[in-house]
Amino acid sequence: GPVPPSTALRELIEELVNITQNQKAPLCNGSMVWSINLTAGGFCVALDSLTNVSGCSAIEKTQRMLSGFCPHKVSAGQFSSLHVRDTKIEVAQFVKDLLLHLKKLFREGQFN
C-alpha cells in the first residue's frame, strides 16, 4: 500500500548520517557553500546551496535525494535572498546542520 513520505525522509536522513560518520578527509575537499535559513527555506534552498558543489561523489546522492522533495527545478543562486548574511560554510558543516533540521522535522512528524 501507500508509504508515508516520512519513509523517504528517513532514507535521506540515513544518507546524511552515513556521510557524517564515514567522513575521513575533508568533505568535498573543503568546498564552501552558502549557509541558509533551513527553517524558512527547506529542501529547495538546501538543494540550491549544494548545487554549486560539483565533482564530489560523496554528496551526489544527497543532491539527488533533495531534488525529490523540491517541486521545481533548482538552479544555483535561485534562493540567494535566503542565504544567511552572505555567509559561507564548509559542506561538512552544512550536512550536519541539514541533518539536525531533518531529524527535527522527522521527530515532529511533519511528514506524516
Epitope: V3, R10, M65, S67, G68
Partner: antibody
Framework: EVQLLESGGGLVQPGGSLRLSCAAS????????MSWVRQAPGKGLEWVSA????????YYADSVKGRFTISRDNSKNTLYLQMNSLRAEDTAVYYC????????????????WGQGTTVTVSS | SYELTQPPSVSVSPGQTASITCSGD??????ACWFQQKPGQSPVLVIY???KRPSGIPERFSGSNSGDTATLTISGTQAMDEADYYC?????????FGTGTKVTVLG
C-alpha cells in the same frame, strides 16, 4: 548492490494478458518510486508507468492507460505490471527501473535498470 | 503531448567532440537526463540534473540545458562511446524520452 530482476515475459496472443514482476534488492524498496520502461525491437525507449514510493500515486503513458496496471508489494520488494488487452505494438523488452525518493521522485534520474524481460504479442 | 526531438545520427572521429541536441518546448525549465545504450544492453544514466555526472561516468561526458534545448557533449570521443543516446524529461505527470541519436565513431 542495487539489483532489479524482471520476469514474466513471454509469447501471448493479441487480446491476451500477462503479468510482469520485478524483484528488487540492495535498497529500501518501499522508499523509492519505480517505473516500467519498454523498448520495441529496433526502436527507442518508451516510458510505460510509474508508482511513487511516498504517496502511492500511479502514472501511465497514454498508450497503455486503461489496459495496464502497475502495483507493488513492499513486503516482498516486488514491482508488478499487469498487462491486459495486449496488442502487437506492445511487443518489446520491458525494463524495471528504480526512480527517486519523495513526492517529486522524477527529479532524481533513473540510474538503476534491470536486464529486461521480453514480451511478444503475436498470433 | 510533450515531445523531445533528437537528430537520428551523429558521426564523430576518435578524439573529436560529439554534440547531441534534444529539443522540447521550454525544456530548460525542466531537469534533463541523458542515457547511453549499447546493443543488447540496458540503458545507463550518463547525465542527470542537466549537467551532473553520476559516479563512474567519465569526465568527457557533459551536459547543458537552457531555452528549448538540452545538449549532451562527448569530448575526446572514444570508440567505446559508440551507442544510442536518449534524452529524458518529466512533463505533465509523464516521463518523456527523446527520439534517440545513434553516435557512430568513425575509423
Amino acid at each position: 548492490e542495487v539489483q532489479l530482476l524482471e520476469s514474466g515475459g513471454g509469447l501471448v496472443q493479441p487480446g491476451g494478458s500477462l503479468r510482469l514482476s520485478c524483484a528488487a534488492s540492495g535498497f529500501t524498496f518501499s522508499s523509492y518510486a519505480m517505473s516500467w520502461v519498454r523498448q520495441a525491437p529496433g526502436k527507442g525507449l518508451e516510458w510505460v508507468s510509474a508508482f511513487s514510493g511516498s504517496g502511492g500515486s500511479t502514472y501511465y503513458a497514454d498508450s497503455v492507460k486503461g489496459r495496464f496496471t502497475i502495483s507493488r508489494d513492499n513486503s516482498k520488494n516486488t514491482l508488478y505490471l499487469q498487462m491486459n488487452s495486449l496488442r502487437a505494438e506492445d511487443t518489446a523488452v520491458y525494463y524495471c527501473v528504480q526512480d527517486g525518493l519523495g513526492p517529486y521522485f522524477y527529479n532524481y534520474g533513473m540510474d538503476v535498470w534491470g536486464q529486461g524481460t521480453t514480451v511478444t504479442v503475436s498470433s | 503531448s510533450y515531445e523531445l526531438t533528437q537528430p537520428p545520427s551523429v558521426s564523430v572521429s576518435p578524439g573529436q567532440t560529439a554534440s547531441i541536441t534534444c529539443s522540447g518546448d521550454k525544456l530548460g525549465d525542466k531537469y534533463a537526463c541523458w542515457f547511453q545504450q549499447k546493443p543488447g544492453q540496458s540503458p545507463v544514466l550518463v547525465i542527470y540534473h542537466d549537467s551532473k555526472r553520476p559516479s563512474g561516468i567519465p569526465e568527457r561526458f557533459s551536459g547543458s540545458n537552457s531555452g528549448d534545448t538540452a545538449t549532451l557533449t562527448i569530448s575526446g570521443t572514444q570508440a567505446m562511446d559508440e551507442a544510442d543516446y536518449y534524452c529524458q524529461a518529466w512533463d505533465s505527470s509523464t516521463y518523456v524520452f527523446g527520439t534517440g541519436t545513434k553516435v557512430t565513431v568513425l575509423g
